[in-house]
């Protein structure tokens, strides 16, 4: 009798020990995970994060779609709507260069760096070649007439435009449009001015920064958050809090991301900080990630979202700050009338696109999203989509703009910059992070379940035996 009872009690005790051990392993395991994650996401030599941060292991592609103008003469002569037809994708591999001038500052736990720019054309991922021709707005004519609204100078510009046989529109190759060409009109200016023009000129052999970001050594909740950009905490482009440099560069975020969080990040492409909100759970190559998207609210007018009041910098084009979905970044582009929007004027007010025919905004294709692994805060997949537009205004002094009766925010191109963790990297991530966490969770659950089941089963058996013995 004793042997059996002792056996049952022993079984119950073992069950209890297993259950307690499983229970203890939950907070202890979480602590271990947190400790490991905290150690590995710090931006210093020797960590997983640092290795991937210095040079991204993910292949990043930037696809361009060019808006080819179908009716240039009609627009110039009759101020008709601009008919555009998008052509693309034309794909370039970007962000393949390692960060440069990496300098740790132990005093304030920051690391500074430059992000070099480079683009390599990928013919196999493109619909044509870099020599393909497009009819687009004449960038120099539109910009010069905006930068110099002075009627006297506009007469001078008109002489130069006519002499160079320039017009409101021009035919340019993809390579010229993106990376730069010598403009014939600007070449006539008898002063030392930059005569090269291009949507991304200069790009190759340039670098973005200097960025100075927190390395996370003192506080993991600050890791990758930008401290300063080009030596400043503000941009000097916007009023009030709109001018602040908030969050990270979106390549990663501090670990342990919650669905309720609003993720702030700074994008030098759009000359501002912006934010993303949780949309859905996604399974990316076996890794559970959170999909964060840029909400339409971020592009709203101050009427719809008062927080955006300081992004409205002028009253005329914005129709007294009631227009939405376009951002005037001219202050960030040496006065050139550049407007940033989402592709096809997604989330933009009807007045913005009423002068353009041929646009088809589509949330799935044209919004920006980030897929973030919540434990590490790493962005494992993203699609950054934006459209670059140029404002062109009527001018009674410039012949080629004389017959325009209204302002046009002219779409030049839109881009889709994407990156997805590679299969090898995903496998490694699964084994090193997700796998280990899942394994730990599984062990916890098995120990707890087996322990509880053993304890309950042995206790019931023991009680049953006891009651039989008493009878």
């Amino acid at each position: 009798g004793c042997d059996r009872n002792c056996g049952l009690i022993t079984g119950a005790v073992i069950g209890a020990v297993l259950a307690v051990f499983g229970g203890i392993l939950m907070p202890v395991g979480d602590m271990l995970i947190q400790k490991t994650i905290k150690k590995e996401v710090v931006l210093e030599e020797g960590t997983i994060a640092f290795k991937n941060w210095v040079k991204t292991g993910t292949e990043i592609y930037r696809q361009f779609w060019i808006f080819d103008v179908q009716n240039p003469q009609e627009v110039m002569m009759n101020s008709s709507n601009i008919q555009v037809k998008q052509r693309g994708p034309y794909t370039y591999r970007v962000r393949f260069l390692a960060k440069e001038n990496i300098t740790q500052d132990p005093k304030d736990n920051t690391v500074s760096f430059l992000q070099p720019n480079g683009a390599i054309f990928e013919p196999s991922l493109s619909v044509g070649t870099e020599a393909d021709n497009f009819t687009v707005l004449n960038l120099a004519v539109a910009a010069a007439s905006h930068i110099y609204p002075n009627p006297f100078v506009q007469v001078v510009l008109n002489s130069l435009i006519n002499k160079s046989k320039s017009s409101m529109f021009q035919v340019r190759t993809l390579r010229e449009l993106l990376w730069g060409y010598t403009d014939p009109f600007l070449s006539l200016v008898p002063y030392p001015v930059s005569t090269r023009v291009g949507m991304f000129y200069p790009y190759n052999n340039t670098a973005d920064g200097v960025y100075k970001v927190f390395n996370g050594k003192d506080s993991i909740s600050k890791v990758a958050i930008i401290d300063t950009y080009k030596g400043k905490r503000n941009l000097s482009y916007w009023e009030s809090y709109c001018d602040m440099i908030n969050g990270t560069d979106a390549a990663s975020f501090p670990p342990f991301v919650e669905k309720s969080q609003v993720l702030q990040f700074f994008s030098s492409d759009i000359c501002r900080s912006i934010y993303a909100v949780f949309e859905s759970d996604v399974n990316l190559k076996g890794i559970p990630v959170y999909r964060f998207v840029l909400p339409s609210k971020a592009f709203a007018s101050p009427v719809q979202n008062p927080d955006n009041h300081c992004f409205c910098t002028e009253k005329i084009i914005s129709k007294n700050c009631t227009s939405y979905g376009v951002l005037d970044i001219s202050k960030c582009k040496e006065g050139k009338p550049v407007y940033i929007s989402l592709p096809h004027f997604l989330y933009a007010s009807p007045d913005v696109s009423e002068t353009i025919d041929g646009l088809n905004p589509n949330e799935e294709e044209h919004r920006t999203y980030l897929d973030i692994e919540p434990i590490t805060g790493f962005t494992l997949q993203f699609a950054k989509r934006l459209q670059v537009n140029l404002l062109v205004k009527p001018s009674n002094k410039i012949q080629v703009l004389k017959r325009l009766k209204r302002n046009y925010i002219v779409p030049i191109l839109w881009l889709n910059e994407t990156g997805t963790i590679g299969d090898e990297k995903a496998k490694m991530f699964r084994s090193q992070v997700t796998g280990k966490i899942n394994l730990l969770g599984l062990i916890e659950m098995i120990l707890l379940s087996v322990g509880v089941v053993m304890f309950v089963a042995f206790m019931i058996s023991y009680c049953a035996c006891r009651s039989k013995t008493i009878k």
């Epitope: 100078v153 001078v156 002489s159 006519n162 200016v189 008898p190």
Partner: antibody, heavy 117, light 107 residues
Framework: EVQLVESGGGLVQPGGSLRLSCAAS????????IHWVRQAPGKGLEWVAW????????YYADSVKGRFTISADTSKNTAYLQMNSLRAEDTAVYYC??????????WGQGTLVTVSS | DIQMTQSPSSLSASVGDRVTITCRAS??????VAWYQQKPGKAPKLLIS???SLYSGVPSRFSGSGSGTDFTLTISSLQPEDFATYYC?????????FGQGTKVEIK
Amino acid sequence: EVQLVESGGGLVQPGGSLRLSCAASGFTISSFGIHWVRQAPGKGLEWVAWIAPYGGETYYADSVKGRFTISADTSKNTAYLQMNSLRAEDTAVYYCARSFFGYFDYWGQGTLVTVSS
Amino acid sequence: DIQMTQSPSSLSASVGDRVTITCRASQDVSNWVAWYQQKPGKAPKLLISYATSLYSGVPSRFSGSGSGTDFTLTISSLQPEDFATYYCQQHSNAPLTFGQGTKVEIK
């Protein structure tokens, strides 16, 4: 070195004509455009005429419109001011000046035009 | 036409003085204002363009300020060679117009 040299001034009777020349060196006049500015004795400066770059448009002060004509000979790198139907109030030192953005960075030494009977 | 009104029309000052000349445009000319110095029997010389931009070779004691309709030329410490007549000019719109001039004389 940029230089502007005016010539052609002198004494002329009311109703008469005169042609001023402005010879430029050190730059191409067609790239900049040339202005004529005058200064009556003891008075301030008065803008008179302008020829825009690359033989573009010509502009005149209301006081000389229809009487004065500005022109340029790019082969000689010289600008001219043809002055017809001259009046006593046209008496002044006439300067030619270089400008692109509307301010005058180089001036000639001036030539005196006296309209008197 | 845009009128440029300069004040004062003349002033007396001593070497080392700070001198301020003002110019008012009859309509908004943004920052398209130039300042010139003219000595008797000589052609004017450019001092400042775009209201504030000092022309090359001009001493740093000369400075310009203003935007819209009100503009100022300041000589921080008057030197003997600065006694001359000063003109403002708008280069925003044709016809280009000058102020009537300010004569700076020795006190």
